[in-house]
Amino acid sequence: SITTLRPQGSLRDEHHKPTGVPATARPSVAFNIRTSKDPEQEGCNLSLGDSKLLENCGFNMTAKTFFIIHGWTMSGMFESWLHKLVSALQMREKDANVVVVDWLPLAHQLYTDAVNNTRVVGQRVAGMLDWLQEKEEFSLGNVHLIGYSLGAHVAGYAGNFVKGTVGRITGLDPAGPMFEGVDINRRLSPDDADFVDVLHTYTLSFGLSIGIRMPVGHIDIYPNGGDFQPGCGFNDVIGSFAYGTISEMVKCEHERAVHLFVDSLVNQDKPSFAFQCTDSSRFKRGICLSCRKNRCNNIGYNAKKMRKKRNSKMYLKTRAGMPFKVYHYQLKVHMFSYNNSGDTQPTLYITLYGSNADSQNLPLEIVEKIELNATNTFLVYTEEDLGDLLKMRLTWEGVAHSWYNLWNEFRNYLSQPSNPSRELYIRRIRVKSGETQRKVTFCTQDPTKSSISPGQELWFHKCQDGWKMKNKTSPFVNLA
C-alpha cells in the first residue's frame, strides 16, 4: 500500500549517513565532466578541493555548467537517455561544462533507501558548487542542474543547501512516491533556484504515480495532460521492445520528459509551446491557447524564465516521437440548435486546409457535452505546419441512410413528428492558432445552408467582410 512508501529517514536518524551502501572503494557520489563528444568515453572525474584536476579536466570557469543528475536505478548502470542528453547539451552549448553526477551506488538500492539518500547526494552537489564558488570567475548564476526522476529532488536539495542561488533547475518528471505532498524543504520547489521549470510526463491521477502530480516549480508543464504519452501505449511498446511489458510502458512515459528536453536542444527550429491552464480538462476543451500575460512558453531548454508568485501549470499536445512539436488550434463553434439528439453526442471531424498543407480528418473531442445555442470550444492539433488556413470541412460521422438510421428516424418521428432528423446548425467557426496567436473566422459558403446531419459534411471558407465582426483595433477582439 501507499503507506509503506511514507517518507522515511529524518533528522532523528542521523539521516546524513547514506543508506544501504556497500563499503567499497568506489566513491558513492562522483562528478564526471564529459569532455569527449563520444558518449561512451569515461570523461574526467572532478575531486572537491583539487584545483589542478579542474584545470586538467578542462573545466571552463566562465562558461555555463550543466549538472545532469540521474534517478533511481534497477540495473546499477547508466541508461541510454543520459548519453543522449550529454550529447545534445554538448551540441547546443559548445563551450559549456557538462558534468554527470554519478550516484549509482546510492541509487541502486531499494527505492525507499534511494529516496533517503537523495538528501546526502544533494549536499555533496552543493558542496561541489560551494567549492567552485570559491574560484573568482565561477558564477552560480551560470549553473543549470538537470535532474530526472529522483535526480530532480537531488537537484532540489542541492539548490536548497548551496550557499547562494543556482541559476536554473530543470526537473524531468520528478519522482512522485514519498515526495507527493511533503514539506517544501524535502522536495524540489521554486525556492531551490532562480528559475525552476518542470516537465511532468507520468502523473497518474489514481493509485501510485511514478512522477509527482503536484506543481513543484515556477512553471510546471504537463505534456498530453501529464499522463498518457503518445507512442507509449501497450501496442506501441510491444512493437518497439523485445518484451512489451508494463515496466516498459512506465519507462516510456516517465522517460519521455528527458526526450522532450533533448528535443528542445536538438530541434531548435521546431520549438514546442505550452499554454497556461488551470487543469487538463479545460486544456482539452481548447479554452487555454492564450499567450497574453506570459500565458504561453517554450518547453524544455528554451523555456523563458517566469518567476510568478504562484505556480504556473501549463499544457500542450505532442507527437509520438521526435520532433515532438505539434500545432494547436482552438475552434469556437456556435451550434444554433441540435434536433433529436437524444443522449448520443455527435461524432464530428474537422479537416483544415492551409497554404502549406492540409490536415488529416481531426476528431472534435467532446470533453463534456455539446451545449445548444452556445459556443462550444474544441482543441485540435496537427503534426505539420499548415500555413495560413484557407478553408475547412466539418464532417458528422455516420451513415446518412442506413436501415438502422431509417428505423431510428421512424422512431424519432413517432415520438417527435415535427422534428424527424438529427440536425446541427453551424453558421461559423472561429479558429485561433496557438503557435501564431492568429484568429480567423470561417463561415458557411451559403448562409442559408448551415445544417449538418450524420453522414454529411459542411464546408467553411474565410468569412467575407460582411460576416466579420466590425472592430477598429482587431476584428476578433470580442471573440477571445
Epitope: R6, P7, S10, L11, R12, E14, H15, H16, R119, Q123, A126, N160, F161, V162, K163, G164, E180, G181, V182, D183, I184, N185, R186, S189, P190, D191, R213, M214, R310, N311
Partner: antibody, heavy 116, light 107 residues
Framework: QVQLQQSGAELMKPGASVKISCKAT????????IAWVKQRPGHGLEWIGE????????KYNKKFKGKATFTADTSSNTAYMQLSSLTSEDSAVYYC?????????WGQGTSVTVSS | DIVMTQSHKFMSTSVGDRVSITCKAS??????VAWYQQKPGQSPKLLIY???YRFTGVPDRFTGSGAGTEFTFTINSVQAEDLAVYYC?????????FGGGTKLEIK
C-alpha cells in the same frame, strides 16, 4: 533526542531591539531549516520565517521583513532571531521549530513583553 | 498568500466520542498539510504531516485526510488528555500559513 532550548523571557521598552536564541541538540544542525513562529495571547500561530544554518539562507514572511532578522552560529548550534523597533504588537511568545516533515520539534517558547 | 480557514473556533465533545476538525485552503495545496496540537501552557506538537501521515509516536486514534483544498483531522476516541487547540498548516508554499485553530473542549 532532538531538543531546542530557547532563551528566557524578556521585558523590553518600545523602540528597543531584542535577540532571542535557540540552541539545538540531537541532530545535524547545519542541514535543517529552523523556523520562527509568533503567538500572541489568545491568537493563533504566525510563521515569521526560517533559516538554514549551514548556508545562512533565509526565507521571510513579508509581513515580518524589516522587523525580524535571523542568524545562526554553527559552531555552537544556535539560531538567533532579532526583533527591532519593538511595539506593543510585538508582545508575544516566540517559538523556534526545526522543519523536516513539518515543524517536527519546537522550543519551549520565549515570552517577549513590550511595555513602557 | 494561501489562507487556511478552520471554520470552528471551538468544538465540544465527550470522552470516547469521535470528533472531526476541518480546514479549508484558499487554493490547491495538494496534500501538503500538517496538523499540530497545542495543550494549555505548552509548545505545539506535530501530529500529522502530508495530510494523512502520523508523525513518530503519535497514537493511531489521530488521523488526517483530504487533498486539494479540503482537509479533515479526526480523533477516533477522544481521551481527556486531548483537550487542546488544534492547528492546520500548509507546507506547500512560502509563506507557510496556519489555520486560526480549533479549541477542543471535553464535556
Amino acid at each position: 533526542q532532538v531538543q531546542l532550548q530557547q532563551s528566557g523571557a524578556e521585558l523590553m521598552k518600545p523602540g528597543a531591539s531584542v535577540k532571542i536564541s535557540c540552541k539545538a541538540t540531537g541532530y545535524t544542525f547545519s542541514t535543517y531549516w529552523i523556523a520562527w513562529v509568533k503567538q500572541r495571547p489568545g491568537h493563533g500561530l504566525e510563521w515569521i520565517g526560517e533559516i538554514l544554518p549551514g548556508s545562512a539562507k533565509t526565507k521571510y514572511n513579508k509581513k515580518f521583513k524589516g522587523k525580524a532578522t535571523f542568524t545562526a552560529d554553527t559552531s555552537s548550534n544556535t539560531a538567533y532571531m532579532q526583533l527591532s523597533s519593538l511595539t506593543s504588537e510585538d508582545s508575544a511568545v516566540y517559538y523556534c521549530a526545526v522543519y523536516d516533515y513539518g515543524a517536527d520539534y519546537w522550543g519551549q517558547g520565549t515570552s517577549v513583553t513590550v511595555s513602557s | 498568500d494561501i489562507v487556511m480557514t478552520q471554520s470552528h473556533k471551538f468544538m465540544s465533545t465527550s470522552v470516547g466520542d469521535r470528533v472531526s476538525i476541518t480546514c479549508k485552503a484558499s487554493q490547491d495545496v495538494y496534500t501538503a498539510v500538517a496538523w499540530y496540537q497545542q495543550k494549555p501552557g505548552q509548545s505545539p506538537k506535530l501530529l500529522i504531516y502530508s495530510a494523512s501521515y502520523r508523525f513518530t509516536g503519535v497514537p493511531d486514534r489521530f488521523t488526517g485526510s483530504g487533498a486539494g483544498t479540503e482537509f479533515t483531522f479526526t480523533i477516533n476516541s477522544v481521551q481527556a488528555e486531548d483537550l487542546a487547540v488544534y492547528y492546520c498548516q500548509q507546507h506547500y508554499s512560502i509563506p507557510r500559513t496556519f489555520g486560526g485553530g480549533t479549541k477542543l473542549e471535553i464535556k
